[in-house]
């Protein structure tokens, strides 16, 4: 009975990802059988999130969209080990938004899913930012630098990266 | 008061080219992101080129994208659009524009009076 | 790209009386409560003017007889008392995301 209303549970569960996300990628966290995360196919998981390269090019305001009606954000980076996860999913020769603005171009940056803006987690390439008419983030390649984050025009379409939290069941 | 002053237009023909000029006063140019839009005979508007104040990025519509090239001398005050492989569809009066962000996006608040472009054997 | 479709073409009004001229965009432009749309005047053998930016905002200069408003993919410029120097072609454009698109024009005379 237990096991059977679980099972319950875990497909009703998945009914709520599934317009979305018909396919799901699911992995036993531990030891325990009761506990697995997903991550949608064919998106790649590191520690509990899950991510998309969005390889169609659009402006900041709808890769974002694009991103939320996956249920997922624009990428938020929070330590130098997810860039270092993220990066090997990139082509070097493409250039990817990240989920950080400065919408009222007064260098106030801000992540999509209000994260604070902590300074000294930031992975900007030298010299940048630097352009107040730039307002939004990207993450690309510089062979001086590898790979670092620029500021560029939000209208301007690039490919992206979306991320979500990792599915329970 | 801004003005943008464009020149270096005129008659040339297919497969010809041309440097235009916009020459800026009024305000300081080298922080601002610049464009040329330009108007064919009785037609609409068309978006060609922009510019970052740097000069390090710059954006263009297919239709013009490895033609036409965007470039500027902060030192000198000047916005340039060097155009190649010119086609009869490029004769249009040219005006250069400055750039105001507007949260994620922008308008073009100032125009220059345009130069005019004929494309013609 | 995103069309912007104006209507109508042309628009003749008598003078002190209302001219609406309508704009549709082929997707939405909106985003986080603001909408990417611009309104331009283009009067003969002269620039375009900017009057209204990000749909509803009035331009610094201009008289406060013209108006935007509108979200997601129609916008609407009015003039609420047409005045003999509004006579002109208005332009919409979009700058949600390159490149940036405007519509075909409409074109306002005296009735």
């Known amino acids: 009975n237990f096991m059977y209303s679980k099972t319950v549970k875990r497909l009703s569960k998945l009914r709520e990802y599934q317009q979305y996300h018909p396919s799901l990628t699911c992995v036993m966290e531990g030891k325990d059988i009761e506990d697995w995360s997903c991550c949608p196919t064919p998106w790649t998981s590191f520690q509990s999130s899950c991510y998309f390269i969005s390889t169609g090019m659009q402006s900041w305001t709808k890769s974002q969209k694009n991103c939320s009606v996956m249920g997922a954000d624009l990428v938020v980076i929070n330590t130098r080990e997810e860039q270092d996860f993220i990066i090997q999913n990139l082509k070097r020769n493409s250039s990817y938004f990240l989920g950080l603005s400065d919408p009222g171009g007064r260098r106030h940056w801000q992540w999509v899913d209000q994260t604070p803006y902590n300074e000294n987690v930031t992975f900007w390439h030298s010299g940048e930012p630097n352009n107040l008419d730039e307002r939004c983030a990207i993450i690309n390649f510089r062979s001086s630098e590898e790979w670092g984050w620029n500021d560029i025009h939000c209208h301007v379409p690039q490919k992206s990266i979306c991320k979500m939290k990792k599915i329970y069941i | 008061e801004v003005q943008l002053l464009e020149s270096g237009g005129g008659l040339v023909q297919p497969g010809g080219s041309l440097r235009l000029s916009c020459a800026a006063s009024g305000f300081t140019f080298s922080t601002y992101t610049m464009s040329w839009v330009r108007q064919a005979p009785g037609k609409g508007l068309e978006w060609v080129a922009t510019?970052?104040?740097?000069?390090?990025?710059?954006y263009y519509p297919d239709s013009v994208k490895g033609r036409f090239t965007i470039s500027r001398d902060n030192s000198k005050n000047t916005l340039y659009l060097q155009m190649n492989s010119l086609r009869a569809e490029d004769t249009a009066v040219y005006y250069c524009?400055?750039?105001?962000?507007?949260?994620?996006?922008?308008?073009?608040?100032?125009w220059g009076q345009g130069t005019t472009v004929t494309v013609s054997s | 790209d995103i069309v912007m479709t104006q209507s109508p073409d042309s628009l003749a009004v008598s003078l002190g009386e209302r001219a609406t001229i309508n704009c549709k965009a082929s997707?939405?432009?909106?985003?986080?409560?603001?909408?990417?749309v611009n309104w331009y005047q283009q009067k003969p053998g002269q620039p375009p003017k900017l009057l209204i930016y990000g749909a509803s905002n009035l331009e610094s200069g201009i008289p406060d007889r013209f108006s935007g408003s509108g979200s997601g993919t129609d916008f609407t410029l009015t003039i609420s008392s047409l005045q003999a120097e509004d006579v002109a072609v208005y332009y919409c454009?979009?700058?949600?995301?390159?490149?940036?698109?405007f519509g075909g024009g409409t074109k306002v005379e005296i009735k």
């Open positions: 510019i970052n104040s740097g000069g390090d990025n710059t």
């Open positions: 454009q979009q700058s949600d995301e390159d490149p940036w698109t």
């Open positions: 524009a400055t750039y105001r962000p507007y949260y994620y996006g922008s308008v073009l608040d100032y």
């Open positions: 997707q939405s432009v909106d985003y986080d409560g603001n909408s990417y």
